[in-house]
C-alpha cells in the first residue's frame, strides 16, 4: 500500500489530516484548522477495538444462556466480550453465536480428541486389536483383552465393537 497524505493514526477529511480516536473511544467531532479531533470514551456496555473515526461504539456481545453460552472473558472499552459454551456443549460456528451438544462416538469408534468449548468431539474407527462397545463422548478405543497373559485362549474373536472372549485351554489327555 503506497503512503497516503495522512500519517498512521490519522484520517483525511476536507483537505486536512485529523487524529483518529484511540481504541475505547468514539469520534465526537473532526478536527478543524484550530481544534483537535474530539473523542469520547465508550460506555460500559460498549467497545471499539481499533484506532477509529466511528461515531458510535459497538455493543458488547451478549452470551445468551438460553443458547448454551457463558462469558469466557468480560468485554472492556477496547475489547468485545468472549463467549464460550457450557460444559458438554461446543460452538456451532466460529462466531460462537449458539452451542450444540458434543457428538458421541458410536460403538466401533473411539474418541480421538475430546471436545472443547469451541470444537466438537473427533471420533476415529477402532483399528484391528481395539474396540468400543459404547456410545461415548469420552471413551477411546480399548485394546482387546490379551487371553495369553491370563493363560487363557481366544474362544471368540474380537471385533471393532466387541472384545475377544477368552476361555480355558483344552486339556490334552
Amino acid at each position: 500500500e503506497p503512503p497516503t497524505a495522512c500519517r498512521e493514526k490519522q484520517y483525511l477529511i476536507n483537505s486536512q489530516c485529523c487524529s483518529l480516536c484511540q481504541p475505547g473511544q468514539k469520534l465526537v467531532s473532526d478536527c478543524t484548522e484550530f481544534t483537535e479531533t474530539e473523542c469520547l470514551p465508550c460506555s460500559e456496555s460498549e467497545f471499539l477495538d481499533t484506532w477509529n473515526r466511528e461515531t458510535r461504539c459497538h455493543q458488547h456481545k451478549y452470551c445468551d444462556p438460553n443458547l448454551g453460552l457463558r462469558v469466557q472473558q468480560k468485554g472492556t472499552s477496547e475489547t468485545d466480550t468472549i463467549c464460550t459454551c457450557e460444559e458438554g456443549l461446543h460452538c456451532m460456528s466460529e462466531s460462537c453465536e449458539s452451542c450444540v451438544p458434543h457428538r458421541s462416538c458410536l460403538p466401533g469408534f473411539g474418541v480421538k480428541q475430546i471436545a472443547t468449548g469451541v470444537s466438537d468431539t473427533i471420533c476415529e474407527p477402532c483399528p484391528v486389536g481395539f474396540f468400543s462397545n459404547v456410545s461415548s463422548a469420552f471413551e477411546k478405543c480399548r485394546p482387546w483383552t490379551s487371553c495369553e497373559t491370563k493363560d487363557l485362549v481366544v474362544q471368540q474373536a474380537g471385533t471393532n465393537k466387541t472384545d475377544v472372549v477368552c476361555g480355558p485351554q483344552d486339556r490334552q489327555r
Epitope: 503512503p3 497516503t4 500519517r7 476536507n14 483537505s15 486536512q16 489530516c17 484548522e33
Partner: antibody, heavy 116, light 107 residues
Framework: QVQLVQSGAEVKKPGSSVKVSCKAS????????IEWVRQAPGQGLEWMGV????????NYNEKIKDRVTLTADKSTSTAYMELSSLRSEDTAVYYC?????????WGQGTLVTVSS | DIQLTQSPSSLSASVGDRVTITCRAS??????LNWYQQKPGKTIKLLLN???RLHSGVPSRFSGSGSGTDFTFTISSLQPEDIATYYC?????????FGGGTKVEIK
Amino acid sequence: QVQLVQSGAEVKKPGSSVKVSCKASGYAFSDYLIEWVRQAPGQGLEWMGVINPGSGGSNYNEKIKDRVTLTADKSTSTAYMELSSLRSEDTAVYYCARGGGGFTYWGQGTLVTVSS
Amino acid sequence: DIQLTQSPSSLSASVGDRVTITCRASQDISNYLNWYQQKPGKTIKLLLNFASRLHSGVPSRFSGSGSGTDFTFTISSLQPEDIATYYCQQGSTLPWTFGGGTKVEIK
C-alpha cells in the same frame, strides 16, 4: 499573509512532461496539505491529487495517477506537480491550493498548453 | 466517485437581489461541502467551508446551509463585484469532486 506563487506558463509537445512549481509563504509549509486542481479551457475544476509536505505522503485521482507525481521540498517551501505523457486533453490551467478545511488558499494558476 | 449537481448553471440577477444556488450530492457527505468563487483573471477564493462556515475575510452577505446531500449557497444582496462563477466541492471522500459551476451575471 498566506501566498502560493506558481511557475509561469508552459507550451509542451504531446508525449513530453511538464513540472509546475508552487512556492508557499506566510504559514508553516509542513503543517498543511497541498492540493492540485486543473481546469481545461471553458470547463469546470478537476482534482488531481494531494501531498503532505511534512511526510511526503500523497493521494492521487485514479484517472491520472499513472502520469502524475507530486513532491514537496521543505527547505524551499515549494510543492511540485509533474505530469508525464502529455496529450492535447491536458491543456489546462493548473492550480495548487493549501488545504485545511477545504482549499483555503489558491495559487494564481499555471497555463499548460499541449500542442504539436 | 461522489457526483455534485449544481443548479442553476447560470443566472442573471439585479444588484441587491437575493441569489440562491443549490448543490446536490450523490451520497451523504455530512457537512463536508465548500463553496468557491472564481472571477476572470483572479485567484480562486474559498468563501465557505463545512457547508456554512464563513472563511476569514469573506463578507457576511455570503452564507451556506445544508447537510447530508442537499446544500444551499446564498448571496443575500448581490453586489457588482460578485459577478463570478461559483463552485461547490465535497471534502468527504476521495477523490474530491466539484460541482459544474454556476455563472452569476448582473441584469
